[in-house]
Interface confidence: low
């Protein structure tokens, strides 16, 4: 018997690492292996179209499944049946069970990242389940679904009890069937009275919404159809076993007869128009790493070509409750550092006939900003720079610090919150920032923080290139050039005049432009040049000087 | 010369309010300091109160303790204050402001004041 | 919240000899370095000792001496002078989602 369906659900989540035995397998899910590998692509079963109440359960074959050691999903049954109550509006839903309505459009929607990843389930106890599509693709995607929270016990089968009453034209004689619906989806019929036998429909009309299943073997490169029915069928030329046919070439069309002795001529003809190979298609990570921190891009490719029409290829993705119908999907505003899982399909002529699962996990994003602090110099040479580290994941800091056009810059360790800046200039602002970054698939710098100061003054260098020429006997014209550097806010010459040890002239000028007059006549001076910043005095430029015997 | 001085301690009642000042000179706090109250009960250890940073960020950090009760602002770029509310007698202390604790910049170690009594009492 | 035990008071010490306070932090500094220690006489604010656990502060004699990582650290005198008699406070500081800032409960050291 087939397992009993769970009720529609659908779930974003992480795969478990370790399958999850004890759930029902749902009908026309695929069973994915556990997820020690981020990606699988699996044959898919798939049936499209509604039931009729011949056919209310069908069941995944285990050999179908590629030989996969299958965990349980919870998913969405792809069984449809208007005929009869399903389990989705006959059973109450359990605790925890939510219902959600999913569209086509996800202009509105939110893409959470998979519980279990950096994110934290609201749900207590949660368990990470693989999830699966709304698998009728003719059907609107305004499905609502019911978003089921696992359960370890599977839910109990339902039995349907119908009393179906038969009116012949004796008024007295009344037919009265008890028909049970089994879990298997066979019907018991219990039979009160007989009074008259409904004729048997006709094949083609039993069959007539007969569904099927492609699986895919890769070794072979074959495909077998497997017929959607519970009682076994005979095709013609025995080209069916057990209700699947054998050995289809991808990309070709084959008629199948079928009959069945419940009911009578014509029998059904079906065309099976068999899918591309599976292995034709690949999905690829198109993500640009630089923007991997925040987008994920998934691409179907195909990888070898087929005869097929492309034109009855269709594909579909499912990204937590986004569903997108594109070949090519991109994500973007997702959280760094998160997983997320998208389960892809690809369909032809609306029968699913291989699917991938993707969990990714986005890019570090870039690291946040460092906050300054102390950032700021007590003295000429050096200056100070502590801060906080940033919340986010990185690896080490830039500090650049920067005096007039002059830029300088440190790689630093993660662990410093403090560095100090040695042989700066004196009074000279500069400008520091400090940004940390991550190298992760590019580098990612975070943002910098910005401060400044100003070190103190210091005494300034020497003035330099000092000349001292007489401009008669007894005057002297001092110059020199100012200092390389000035180390302080302000800017005067002073020249003291010395003769022997006695200070005679003690000037101060803007410029380095002196003219001494009245020396003494014919005696040795002493001339000294220095600058003043305002702070500190600098080293004096010396030189010596005589003026000359009068000439008069 | 570069100095702290608080003020604004005093006598008050339990469940009373108190503001403290600090006061800075020979510097302002354009330079982006670390400003802190620390408090000590008579005959009783040191006890951190909160910091906070003179930058722009602005940012203020406090003992579990201490918060909702007290709160640390930057009144002006010489004056930093300690609002005090629902005192209780366990709230008597000096109460000291300190700059750059735990650190030395240039050579300049943590400055700090002289320290402010406060005594709760009705 | 962080708790940081130091050697209990008072500690006696002799004019010359050497004497060693301790500091047990429940939890890692920041860094493993970000501990300070002061020192208090009465009627004073606390003076700067020791900052990063090992570093000198300026003006502070070359007989104090830090020592220390992660979660224990020491405070050692040696050369002991009369001048030295104080209360000595350990500070550590800790980072996470913000700074926050403890002290030990202060060691009396007696000098004889």
């Known amino acids: 018997q087939s397992p009993t369906p769970s009720p529609t659900g659908l779930t974003t989540a992480k795969m478990p690492s370790v399958p999850l035995s004890s759930d029902p397998l749902p009908t026309h899910t695929t069973a994915f292996s556990p997820a020690s590998t981020f990606e699988r692509e699996n044959d898919f079963s798939e049936t499209t179209t509604s039931l009729s109440p011949d056919n209310t359960s069908t069941q995944v074959s285990p050999d179908s499944l590629d030989n996969a050691s299958a965990f349980n999903t919870t998913g969405v049954s792809s069984v449809q049946t208007p005929h009869l109550p399903t389990h989705a509006d006959s059973q109450t839903p359990s605790a925890g069970t939510d219902t959600q309505t999913f569209s086509g459009s996800a202009a509105n929607a939110k893409l959470n990242p998979t519980p279990g990843s950096n994110a934290i389930s609201d749900v207590p106890g949660e368990r990470s389940t693989a999830s699966t599509f709304p698998t009728d693709p003719v059907s609107p995607l305004t499905t609502t679904l019911s978003l089921a929270h696992h359960s370890s016990a599977a839910l109990p089968a339902r039995t349907s009890n119908t009393t179906i009453t038969a009116n012949t034209s004796d008024a007295y004689l009344n037919a009265s069937e008890t028909t049970t619906l089994s879990p298997s989806g066979s019907a018991v019929i219990s039979t009160t009275t007989i009074a008259t036998t409904p004729s048997k429909p006709t094949c083609d009309e039993k069959y007539a919404n007969i569904t099927v299943d492609y699986l895919y073997n890769k070794e072979t490169k074959l495909f077998t159809a497997k017929l959607n029915v519970n009682e076994n069928v005979e095709c013609g030329n025995n080209t069916c076993t057990n209700n699947e046919v054998h050995n289809l070439t991808e990309c070709k069309n084959a008629s199948v007869s079928i009959s069945h002795n419940s009911c009578t001529a014509p029998d059904k003809t079906l065309i099976l128009d068999v899918p591309p190979g599976v292995e034709k298609f690949q999905l690829h990570d198109c993500t640009q790493v630089e923007k991997a921190d925040t987008t994920i891009c998934l691409k179907w490719k195909n990888i070898e070509t087929f005869t097929c029409d492309t034109q009855n290829i269709t594909y579909r993705f499912q990204c937590g409750n986004m569903i997108f119908d594109n070949k090519e999907i991109k994500l973007e505003n997702l959280e760094p550092e998160h997983e997320y899982k998208c389960d892809s399909e690809i369909l032809y002529n609306n029968h699913k006939f291989t699917n991938a699962s993707k969990i990714i996990k986005t890019d570090f994003g870039s690291p946040g900003e460092p906050q300054i602090i102390f950032c700021r110099s007590e003295a000429a040479h050096q200056g100070v720079i502590t801060w906080n580290p940033p919340q986010r994941s990185f690896h080490n800091f830039t500090l650049c610090y920067i005096k007039e056009t002059e830029k300088d810059c440190l790689n630093l360790d993660k662990n410093l919150i403090k560095y100090d800046l040695q042989n700066l200039k004196p009074y000279t602002k500069y400008v520091l920032s400090l940004h940390a970054y991550i190298i992760a698939k590019v580098q990612r710098n975070g943002s910098a923080a910005m401060c400044h100061f100003t070190t103190k003054s210091a005494p300034p260098s020497q003035v330099w290139n000092m000349t001292v020429s007489m401009t008669s006997d007894n005057s002297m014209h001092v110059k020199c050039r100012p200092p390389r550097d000035r180390n302080g806010p302000h800017e005067r010459y002073h020249l003291e005049v010395e003769a022997g040890n006695t200070l005679v002239r003690n000037e101060s000028h803007k410029n380095c432009d002196f003219r001494v007059k009245d020396l003494q006549y014919s005696t040795d001076y002493t001339f000294k040049a220095y600058f003043h910043n305002g702070d500190y005095p600098g080293e004096p430029f010396i030189l010596h000087h005589s003026t000359s015997y009068n000439s008069k | 010369q570069e100095q702290l001085v608080e003020s604004g301690g005093g006598l008050v009642q339990p469940e009373g309010s108190l503001t403290l000042t600090c006061t800075a000179s020979?510097?302002?706090?354009?330079?982006?300091?670390?400003m802190c109250w620390v408090r000590q009960a008579p005959g009783k250890g040191l006890e951190w109160i909160g910091c906070?940073?003179?930058?722009?960020?602005?940012?203020t950090y406090y003992a579990s303790w201490a918060k909702g009760r007290f709160t640390i602002s930057k009144t002006s770029s010489t004056t930093v204050t300690l609002q005090m509310t629902s005192l209780t007698a366990a709230d008597t202390a000096t109460y000291f402001c300190?700059?750059?604790?735990?650190?030395?910049?240039?050579?300049?170690?943590?400055?700090w004041g002289q320290g402010t009594l406060v005594t709760v009492s009705s | 919240a962080q708790v940081l035990t130091q050697t209990p008071s008072p500690v006696s010490a002799v004019v010359g000899g050497t004497v060693s306070i301790s500091c047990q932090a429940s939890?890692?500094?920041?860094?493993?370095?970000?501990l300070s220690w002061y020192q208090q006489k009465p009627g004073q604010p606390p003076k700067l000792l020791i900052y990063?656990?090992?570093k000198l502060a300026s003006g502070v004699p070359s007989r104090f001496k830090g020592s220390g990582s992660g979660t224990q650290f020491t405070l050692t005198i040696s050369g002991v002078q009369c001048d030295d008699a104080a209360t000595y406070y350990c500070?550590?500081?800790?980072?996470?989602?913000?700074?926050?800032?403890?002290f030990g409960g202060g060691t009396k050291v007696v000098v004889k």
């Open positions: 300190a700059r750059d604790l735990g650190y030395e910049i240039d050579g300049y170690g943590g400055l």
């Open positions: 020979g510097f302002s706090f354009s330079g982006n300091y670390y």
């Open positions: 906070l940073y003179t930058g722009s960020s602005g940012s």
């Open positions: 939890q890692s500094v920041y860094n493993n370095n970000n």
């Open positions: 990063d656990a090992s």
């Open positions: 500070l550590g500081g800790y980072y996470s989602s913000g700074w926050y800032f403890a």
